[in-house]
Interface confidence: low
């Protein structure tokens, strides 16, 4: 009996109710391999999902995300709102960095601005949601011939965890 089922090709299922005849998958279902006893229900691309590839008798539908969203998870199992610099990805989507933090990357989270005073320096350029502050010499260090300040290396460590 098992051998009869193994002859059923993709796009069909082995119908036990009909003496193990190979029956075509019903509408909105598929079997991607031979010898299947049932066909799987086709994925439906609804809401923030849009159909990239229609379901066929041998392959599942494939989804993309609508404009303004991007795919997350294996096989585009989720759609997440597009992020940009000055935001962080949280479980609730993309959120603006809080005051005093920044994110200049597409990944990761908002990190605190550098505290220039810890190094005895002053703020040369204020920070934004997208950029860290630029520290300059302390007022006492300012003198003719003093070298111009250079931006600090971007911080790598997260400042806080997304909520």
């Amino acid at each position: 009996l098992q051998d009869l089922c193994s002859n059923c090709p993709a796009g069909t299922f082995c119908d036990n109710n009909r003496s193990q005849i190979c029956s075509p998958c019903p509408p909105n279902s598929f079997s991607s391999a031979g010898g299947q006893r049932t066909c799987d229900i086709c994925r439906q691309c609804k809401g923030v999902f849009k159909t990239r590839k229609e379901c066929s008798s041998t392959s599942n539908a494939e989804c993309d995300c609508i404009s303004g969203y991007h795919c997350l998870g294996a096989e585009c199992s989720m759609c997440e709102q597009d992020c940009k610099q000055g935001q962080e990805l949280t479980k609730k989507g993309c959120k603006d960095c809080c005051f005093g933090t920044f994110n200049d990357q597409k990944r990761g989270i908002c990190r605190p601005w550098t505290n220039c005073s810890l190094d005895g320096k002053s703020v040369l350029v204020n920070g934004t949601k997208e950029r860290d502050v630029v520290c300059g010499p302390s007022p006492a260090d300012l003198s003719p011939g003093a070298s111009s300040a250079t931006p600090p290396a971007p911080a790598r460590e997260p400042g806080h965890s997304p909520q």
């Epitope: 993309d64 991007h70 997350l72 294996a74 997440e80 597409k106 990944r107 990761g108 989270i109 997260p158």
Partner: antibody, heavy 118, light 108 residues
């Protein structure tokens, strides 16, 4: 079916250059970030570089910064890695992978071996 | 950079036994950004778990992931012969993206 096929690996002398390619099929290439990840013989995995869907934003591991350049041609569904000033420590199998950003790398190529030796 | 330390380095078990693999981060990582991979000799890595606990497409339910903060775990409830391989954790919480050094699960 999603497929990633790397090519361009081979034997090169220290200081030399190579250009790796990764041909993508089975998905909307222009919608996804892509990455290169390498694995030295008998060692673990090391992320090398990534590129956003439009090719405008790239990032690199410190170990390759200034020597490697990632790029993509969405019209050809192909990812590239230009490797210059190669060193012995760059010897590895180089994989291209579809990058889901937060959720890891869901599809990988079979890899192409780069050997840097005199 | 975030350093991921996996333990043990090698796990010697028999088919049917339970495997517990650990991944510890040098600093807190949001669970959304933690993934696990399986790699067999001569093959590319395969995504098993993303978001610390969600199984990737086609991954059997004997694989499960858990954890948060700095401590994450991959559990294989009953080892099958095809599960003997090297397993890596990976974070994409902040640049550079990093992997653990791997845990080899070998047949006892």
């Amino acid at each position: 079916e999603v497929q990633l096929l790397e090519s361009g690996g081979g034997l090169v002398q220290p200081g030399g250059s190579l250009r790796l390619s990764c041909a993508a099929s089975g998905f909307t290439f222009s919608s996804y970030d892509m990455s290169w990840v390498r694995q030295a013989p008998g060692k673990g995995l090391e992320w090398v570089s990534d590129i956003d869907p439009t090719g405008s934003k790239t990032d690199y591991a410190d170990s390759v910064k200034g020597r490697f350049t990632i790029s993509r041609d969405n019209s050809k569904n192909t990812l590239y890695l230009q490797m210059n000033s190669l060193r012995a420590e760059d010897t590895a199998v180089y994989y291209c992978a579809r990058d889901l950003l937060v959720y890891g790398f869901d599809y990988w190529g079979q890899g192409t071996l780069v050997t840097v030796s005199s | 950079e975030i350093v991921l330390t996996q333990s043990p380095g090698t796990l010697s078990l028999s088919p049917g036994e339970r495997a517990t693999l650990s991944c510890r981060a040098s600093q807190s990582v949001s669970s959304s950004y933690l993934a696990w991979y399986q790699q067999k000799p001569g093959q590319a890595p395969r995504l098993l778990i993303y978001g610390a606990s969600s199984r990737a497409t086609g991954i059997p339910d004997r694989f499960s992931g858990s954890g948060s903060g700095t401590d994450f775990t991959l559990t294989i409830s009953r080892l099958e012969p095809e599960d003997f391989a090297v397993y890596y954790c990976q974070q994409s919480y902040s640049y550079p993206v990093t992997f653990g050094q791997g845990t080899k699960v070998e047949i006892k």
